[in-house]
Amino acid sequence: MQKGDQNPQIAAHVISEASSKTTSVLQWAEKGYYTMSNNLVTLENGKQLTVKRQGLYYIYAQVTFCSNREASSQAPFIASLCLKSPGRFERILLRAANTHSSAKPCGQQSIHLGGVFELQPGASVFVNVTDPSQVSHGTGFTSFGLLKL
Amino acid sequence: MQKGDQNPQIAAHVISEASSKTTSVLQWAEKGYYTMSNNLVTLENGKQLTVKRQGLYYIYAQVTFCSNREASSQAPFIASLCLKSPGRFERILLRAANTHSSAKPCGQQSIHLGGVFELQPGASVFVNVTDPSQVSHGTGFTSFGLLKL
Amino acid sequence: MQKGDQNPQIAAHVISEASSKTTSVLQWAEKGYYTMSNNLVTLENGKQLTVKRQGLYYIYAQVTFCSNREASSQAPFIASLCLKSPGRFERILLRAANTHSSAKPCGQQSIHLGGVFELQPGASVFVNVTDPSQVSHGTGFTSFGLLKL
């Protein structure tokens, strides 16, 4: 990616944070071995990565969760990467689904999402899951990031 | 990525290699449809990718494995992407976990890890797994790479 | 990635399309929140991404599928990222495998593939699966893309 004043590198990698909130939107923090290249990408309210410059971005998320078929709803565990652009409807960019494990007390599984998308100035991306209480927050298990092409 | 003498492309993609070693660190080779852009990234001792230049890198690994719940330990199969920097603690960058399958003789599963990290000159990244004997080495199943932003 | 006439950004992200064809090659479309940076990458016949310029590309695919162990063959569900270069044999770049779920009527699982590869002018990449009828085409579940470094 280009260096220099005109084309600074823009990249972020943030780390999952356990939350007492009941929202399905995952929470993130600048902790551990995080990346925040500069102020052209920011973590807002601990829940969304917001970019200042229009362009193509590779956006990714990884979610590790622990669930059990009997203790969970019939529906699978779904992780969604979503986009919020000024003056636009929110939209789903990417989703992944994993059926719950039969392992007890729960079985761990990992999901990885990633794709190239055009973002507008002020656009934000965030990650939704069906059940945040099942997400694993141990070192390296759940993270979220982007890089500008 | 920038071209030219100042900013050559730096990228690598290496292919898994079965090993008789008892170590949990996976072994890799420059074989098949591998990538090694230049000597600014090297595969050392068949186990780690080492970079010469500081900067932001997107680092990824994919591991396919075949395991059975009854024949394996209670603990899930875990793949870890780890970092070694001169004079620093080794650290876990990313991890993924999958509970063993009940399929017999074993059930195949694939894990993908990827994220953006700042690497120092001389830094090395490597992949650890809980049980290397369960890793699948068929064409394309298990690989490891990086690209400099 | 480089901007300017000499080094335009090259990137694509296409969305899965259900198909009545019996082929194992997945079908894609420029629909929804797709990306097609310019005519240096094109979607051909709805099945392959073709590039005009030689270089290193990060290529990725995500496939979500729903299968059941009893209703499926013994073999796992396999997704393969394949390369077709002018005057060359086709080759497998990446593969991932997931054993079928015991959930009924079927259990959803997601696979992610990604890696850095050198492509020649006119090279095409496509995605093969063992059973296209099991692939999930809901918003964001199955996608395919690349970006030139």
Partner: nanobody, 123 residues
Framework: EVQLVESGGGLVQPGGSLRLSCAAS????????MGWFRQAPGKEREFVAV????????LYADSVKGRFTISADNSKNTAYLQMNSLKPEDTAVYYC????????????????WGQGTLVTVSS
């Protein structure tokens, strides 16, 4: 800044065991990780083991895997290195180090260091 004090070094025969301790003054809550490095005469300081405070995950140098075990007791603000099956090549000064929180990948945070404790493995 955290003050670190090591203890437990000494002379031991090959095949023997030692347990090193590293006591931290102040709160462990400001520490992201604690671990051990070692420096043999005429060699560079090398990583031995680390434990991360967020979930107790550990990593070891290849040369000590299966022989050394790192642990921490947060209530005592202390990290330990249990060293078994010691070999002459384990002879070195062992240093405890602590990495502060908030050390992102884009900055090389300064570690806090102990003064070191000598381990000699010889018959």
């Amino acid at each position: 800044e955290v003050q670190l004090v090591e203890s437990g070094g000494g002379l031991v025969q090959p095949g023997g065991s030692l347990r090193l301790s590293c006591a931290a003054s102040g709160s462990m809550s400001s520490i992201n990780a604690m671990g051990w490095f070692r420096q043999a005469p005429g060699k560079e300081r090398e990583f031995v083991a680390v434990i991360y405070s967020s979930d107790g995950s550990t990593l070891y140098a290849d040369s000590v895997k299966g022989r050394f075990t790192i642990s921490a007791d947060n209530s005592k603000n202390t990290a330990y290195l249990q060293m078994n099956s010691l070999k002459p090549e384990d002879t070195a000064v062992y240093y405890c180090a602590a990495e502060p929180y908030g050390s992102g990948s884009s900055l090389i945070s300064e570690y806090d260091w102990g003064q070191g404790t000598l381990v000699t493995v010889s018959s």
